[in-house]
Structure formats: structure tokens, C-alpha cells
Amino acid sequence: MRTEAQVPALQPPEPGLEGAMGHRTLVLPWVLLTLCVTAGTPEVWVQVRMEATELSSFTIRCGFLGSGSISLVTVSWGGPNGAGGTTLAVLHPERGIRQWAPARQARWETQSSISLILEGSGASSPCANTTFCCKFASFPEGSWEACGSLPPSSDPGLSAPPTPAPILRADLAGILGVSGVLLFGCVYLLHLLRRHKHRPAPRLQPSRTSPQAPRARAWAPSQASQAALHVPYATINTSCRPATLDTAHPHGGPSWWASLPTHAAHRPQGPAAWASTPIPARGSFVSVENGLYAQAGERPPHTGPGLTLFPDPRGPRAMEGPLGVR
């Protein structure tokens, strides 16, 4: 199920309005074109290091290279969290850390990177060929996951080079899909721009919808779309958030900014409620991995300011991993 925002329809201009509206309507294609060209794909890197002092002790470091704000990091081993992996730690940027043996110490290194020390003794201690995965849930990018392990010939004290992600085996389909959509969008915008030279400036007008239709709704990524791809360790980013155009522009004309519900996302870094300010309508591709973003209109019960966790349409605990921790 995917909820679509109401996208205003293009209408011929009303007589006498071309001059007033022309410069405004020119802005939209250029803004979108710029965003098309600059839209970057976030990445996750994973570094696994065996400590020289304790041969079976590991340090895992993970980082997120993206512009969004991180809402949760999950570190697992034996494969990704949802695909047979076991959760080692869950880190929330404001609420803290839950960790599990053999994790000895999980911590935030920066606002976008974490480290996890695994102790080396006991039945659950890691071995050299163990795969460690880090999943970053961020807004607006969605969930991004990368996995890494020590190379077979690693010397103690050496680390595996950081594994960038989306890793090839995981995100090939997603990258192709994203590229296709972006390419199509950019070509279409160029086409619009070319037409614009030969026609009077069109005026954007909200499409006629029923009064019950919400003006801005979040998207609910399809759970099935990823399963159908059958890619192991996949974090396929295929769900595209429709840009919602704010029809209540104070100057009477349309606004070119996405209208986000103010409780849909908050930066964990500080108290500034950035979601209430206009944000460029970027075609953000979010992971369909765990249905992180659902109906943003439904706020979870007694969730604190700046800490909204996104509800899942299947119920309040449907998004939890094997830990019972989001």
C-alpha cells in the first residue's frame, strides 16, 4: 500500500496573470532540476577490527554518510538483523543504548558514527569470519544497511578497510531503480523546460479533491516489494516519497516547498524543530526494509518532543527486531 500526495495539476494560465505568475512557475522546474542533479545516495560504512591485545576481541565501527538525521542504529552479526542476524546493540541518538552479549561497550563516536566493542571470551564470542552489519534508520532517507567482516588473512591489530554501502549485492536493484526514476524525472523536467520556451507560463492549481483528503500524508513503503526481489542482505531503496506542494501559500500563489507534518521527523542533534520550516521538495528514496515511515498523522502514544518514532500500520510493535527494540 502506498499513499500518494495530492499533486496539483497543470492548468492553462488565466488571462492577465502570465506576467505575475511567469517568474514563479519558472522557479519550480529549475529547483527540481537542481535537486535532480544534486540528489545524493546516502551510504553506510562498516569497519571491523581485531584487537591485537585480545585475539578474539573485535571493534566494529559504523558511520552514516547522508544528510538526514539518524533516528536509530542497529548493529547485528551473522547477517542483517532481519535476515537471520542477531542484534548486538541498538543505539538511539537521544534515548541511549541497549546492548547484548557479547557486546561489551556500544557508544556514539560522532552524531553519525558509532563503535561497538565485542568481548572475546565465552560461547557467544565472535570468530574471524563473522559478518557484522550496521543499519541506520534516518529521516528522510529511510533504512540503510551495510555489512563487513575481517578479511581471512587479517593480522591482529589490523582492520578491514571500511566497507561502503549500499553494498553491491544488496543495493544493485535499488540503485538501478533510483537512477532510472531520477533519469526519467530529469529528462521530463528538461522536456518541460524546453516546452516552456514556446508556451505561456502555466499556472499550478490544486487538483480538486474531496475535503476529507489529507493535504500532506506520509508514505507507507510496501513490504512486499523487497521480498519479491530475493536479494540476500538487501536494503533496496525503491520507495519514492511524493513531493507534496503546499497549497496554502501566504502570497496567493503556489509554494514550491514540501509540506511536512511537523511531528513526522525531528533532528536528534538539537531542539530546533526543523520540520516546521519549509524544506525543498526532494525526491527522497526511502528503504522499504522495515516500514519505518508510515502514516505520519498517527503519533505514537506519549512520545516525547523531538523523539518521534514512526508508527507502523501493522501495530505498535510490528517494527521491532528480535530484541523487542526498535
Epitope: 518532543p305 528480535p322 526498535r326
Partner: antibody, heavy 119, light 107 residues
Framework: EVQLQQSGPELAKPGSSVKISCKAS????????IDWVKESHGKSLEWIGA????????NYNQKFKGKATLTVDKSSSTAYMELRSLTSEDSAVYYC????????????WATGTTVTVSS | DIVMTQSQKFMSTSVGDRVSITCKAS??????VDWYQQKPGQSPKALIF???NRHTGVPDRFAGSGSGTDFNLTIRNVQSEDLADYFC?????????FGGGTKLEIR
């Protein structure tokens, strides 16, 4: 109604072991972690550790490693804590509590089990 | 380990008054602090989670604030049933640690 019901008071001899139970009801047992907390005179409250009923994964406060062992029985929705090699320092009230993973806090507490170690 | 310090072991107040209980963390714990109330002979009960959010059913006389290292629990219009011990807890890092507690006495 969500409830955590703990077993009754224990009187134990130094060097022996006790196993305290914590039976959950009113919710899906595997959806929430169970943590254990010690309340002793002069030491306020101390977090002992946590267990995930889903997979039996544990996390212990280093101070209680070797002292406490956390287990679960999914079929009876019961969490257990075994305390071994008991000394008078282990005389305390022990609580099991439910960790709300949506909001990250201990939302439900059991009534507690008093353990008295005396020869 | 992160040390949570509740400097006031006892606080005395009267019904109808406003009182603030403080808790200081030995390092930055963001907003990963909760407050629990323990009445005599009872188990602890959740009051405030993540620094400032009230647990379900907690009267709005109770309010939490703070982030980083300094946290406050404020009770306004104190009632006789508020006689209890109040503990802060950090879950920013393992092991989770509690403050030493503040006993609220009603004059």
C-alpha cells in the same frame, strides 16, 4: 492488565543459590525485554542486567557477572534470575521490570522478592 | 560507569508547595534520563521518561526537564500522597545507573 508477578521471599544460607521467578501476564511476553534491579540498604537501586525473551540474549552489569544468571521460559512467560555463591551483601529486594522499547524506560515493575542471606 | 548524583537526600515540603529534585550525570547523557517514584513499602513506579515525558496516568503536577548533565523533577501543588523516594536513572550507556534517591517529606 499488564502484570509482573514475582516469587515469594527467600531465606538462604551463605554460599548457596536462589532462583527468583517473574511471571508476565497481560501482554506478549516476547515483545518486551525484562530487566532486573537490586534494592539494598545504603546502595539505593542497582541495575543487574537485561534479557530478551525472544532469543535469550543477555546484557549484564559487570558488577553482577558471575553472581546473577538471567534466563527465560517462553512457554510459561516467565523470566528467572539465579543468584549464586550468596553472601550477606546479596541480602536485598530484587525487582523484575519491563523495558518499554518504544519509549525506552521501565514502564511496569513487579512487587519485588526479598532475599535474606543468613546462617 | 556513569554516576548519577542526587545531592539532596531529603527534602521537606508542605502540601500545596512546589518542589524541585535535581539529578546530575557525570557525563553527557543527552535526554536518556527517567524518574521513578517509590512509596514506602512499594516497588518503584515510572513517572517521567526521556527527561520530560510523563508516563501514562501520571498527574501533570509532575514535570521533568533537562538534558546533557543536569536534570530536574518538579512537583507543583505537592499532595500528601507524594511522600516517597524519587530516583533518577540514566540509560545512555551500559550499565544503567540510578541516582541515590531523594526522600520527599511532607511537613
Amino acid at each position: 492488565e499488564v502484570q509482573l508477578q514475582q516469587s515469594g521471599p527467600e531465606l538462604a544460607k551463605p554460599g548457596s543459590s536462589v532462583k527468583i521467578s517473574c511471571k508476565a501476564s497481560g501482554y506478549t511476553f516476547t515483545d518486551y525485554n525484562i530487566d532486573w534491579v537490586k534494592e539494598s540498604h545504603g546502595k539505593s537501586l542497582e541495575w543487574i542486567g537485561a534479557i530478551d525473551p525472544n532469543n535469550g540474549g543477555t546484557n549484564y552489569n559487570q558488577k553482577f557477572k558471575g553472581k546473577a544468571t538471567l534466563t527465560v521460559d517462553k512457554s510459561s512467560s516467565t523470566a528467572y534470575m539465579e543468584l549464586r555463591s550468596l553472601t550477606s551483601e546479596d541480602s536485598a529486594v530484587y525487582y523484575c521490570t519491563r523495558w518499554d522499547s518504544n519509549d525506552w524506560y521501565f514502564d511496569v515493575w513487579a512487587t519485588g522478592t526479598t532475599v535474606t542471606v543468613s546462617s | 560507569d556513569i554516576v548519577m548524583t542526587q545531592s539532596q537526600k531529603f527534602m521537606s515540603t508542605s502540601v500545596g508547595d512546589r518542589v524541585s529534585i535535581t539529578c546530575k550525570a557525570s557525563q553527557n547523557v543527552r535526554s536518556a534520563v527517567d524518574w521513578y517514584q517509590q512509596k514506602p513499602g512499594q516497588s518503584p513506579k515510572a513517572l517521567i521518561f526521556s527527561s520530560s515525558n510523563r508516563h501514562t496516568g501520571v498527574p501533570d503536577r509532575f514535570a521533568g526537564s533537562g538534558s546533557g548533565t543536569d536534570f530536574n523533577l518538579t512537583i507543583r501543588n505537592v499532595q500528601s500522597e507524594d511522600l516517597a523516594d524519587y530516583f533518577c536513572l540514566q540509560h545512555w550507556n551500559s550499565p544503567y545507573t540510578f541516582g541515590g534517591g531523594t526522600k520527599l517529606e511532607i511537613r
